[in-house]
Interface confidence: medium
């Protein structure tokens, strides 16, 4: 496997593009059991109707790979566990990609993105100790291809869930 992006290995802030700029996805630092900061993206507008919050990664070079794999580690909160929520709470989010030769696209243009899948929390999860809490971590892997341009962007669309993206890893498999 060759890793093209690993959010856990980025030093400092990830600085991905969020739309809207405020009130949607927010970059939040949490501490793991070794007191190492983990950069996460979180959103939890479960009572607000008609949510459409986008988060886009930086440009990811494909390094000639035709097919890439996207591994997402996340927590997704059960709507039933949230006090006082109405019918606006969702339990999924959407994963998109957009191929581009331009590594400096500044804005999210939703209509350029192609949907990969709707992501939901699986019954299976791993537990990770983060000091005073146990983190229930879901892992989902999706693949996309064939790719033809120099690189691509990934995007995450929230439609009203309570989510924390803890890790995003993109890789390809050597022949």
């Amino acid at each position: 496997e060759v890793t093209l992006l690993d959010s856990r290995s980025v030093q400092g802030e990830l600085g991905w593009i969020a739309s809207p700029l405020e009130g949607g996805w927010e970059e939040v630092s949490i501490m793991d059991e070794k007191n190492t900061p983990i950069r996460t993206y979180q959103v939890c507008n479960v009572m607000e109707p008609s949510q459409n919050n986008w988060l886009r990664t930086d440009w990811i070079t494909r390094e000639g790979a035709q097919r890439v794999y996207i591994e997402i580690k996340f927590t997704l909160r059960d709507c039933n566990s949230l006090p006082g929520v109405m019918g606006t709470c969702k339990e999924t989010f959407n994963l998109y990609y957009y191929e581009s030769d331009n590594d400096k696209e500044r804005f999210i243009r939703e209509n350029q993105f192609v949907k990969i899948d709707t992501i939901a929390a699986d019954e299976s999860f791993t537990q990770v100790d983060i000091g005073d809490r146990i983190m229930k971590l879901n892992t989902e892997i999706r693949d996309v291809g064939p790719l033809s341009k120099k690189g691509f962007y990934l995007a995450f669309q929230d439609v009203g869930a309570c989510i924390a993206l803890v890790s995003v890893r993109v890789f390809y498999k050597k022949a």
């Epitope: 405020e22 479960v46 909160r77 983060i130 146990i134 924390a164």
Partner: nanobody, 121 residues
Framework: QVQLQESGGGPVRAGESLRLSCTAS????????MGWFRQAPGKERELVAV???????NYADSVKGRFTISRDDAKNTVYLQMNSLKPVDTAVYYC???????????????WGQGTQVTVSS
């Protein structure tokens, strides 16, 4: 870590008013749903009112028309204006913020320590 501190509770007579305040320290809460819950002796904690970042509100049927929730994000404060209070409103009132922090169960939620409201007839 967000911490919440309520104030404004106390003893009142039926028909009178109180305004509860809840101030957050730590991360600003302008992007979060804030709420007030209450717990009467021997009863479960129940929703009183919540307000979303966009200002949408939701009230328990028992307080509609009497209570008003509002927020001042510049002051990191959420308010509960309680008018026409009744003895059945007697309870400990808790401030609450829903955070998307990772964890399990109630570790997603931050609660204040509560403020007592006692309404006598």
């Amino acid at each position: 870590q967000v911490q919440l501190q309520e104030s404004g509770g106390g003893p009142v007579r039926a028909g009178e008013s109180l305004r509860l305040s809840c101030t957050a320290s730590g991360r600003a809460f302008s992007t979060y749903t804030m709420g007030w819950f209450r717990q009467a002796p021997g009863k479960e904690r129940e929703l009183v009112a919540v307000i979303t970042p966009g200002g949408n509100t939701n009230y328990a049927d028992s307080v509609k028309g009497r209570f008003t929730i509002s927020r001042d994000d510049a002051k990191n404060t959420v308010y509960l204006q309680m008018n026409s209070l009744k003895p059945v409103d007697t309870a400990v009132y808790y401030c609450h913020v829903v955070l998307a922090v990772v964890g399990t169960g109630n570790e997603y939620d931050v609660w204040g320590q509560g403020t007592q409201v006692t309404v006598s007839s």
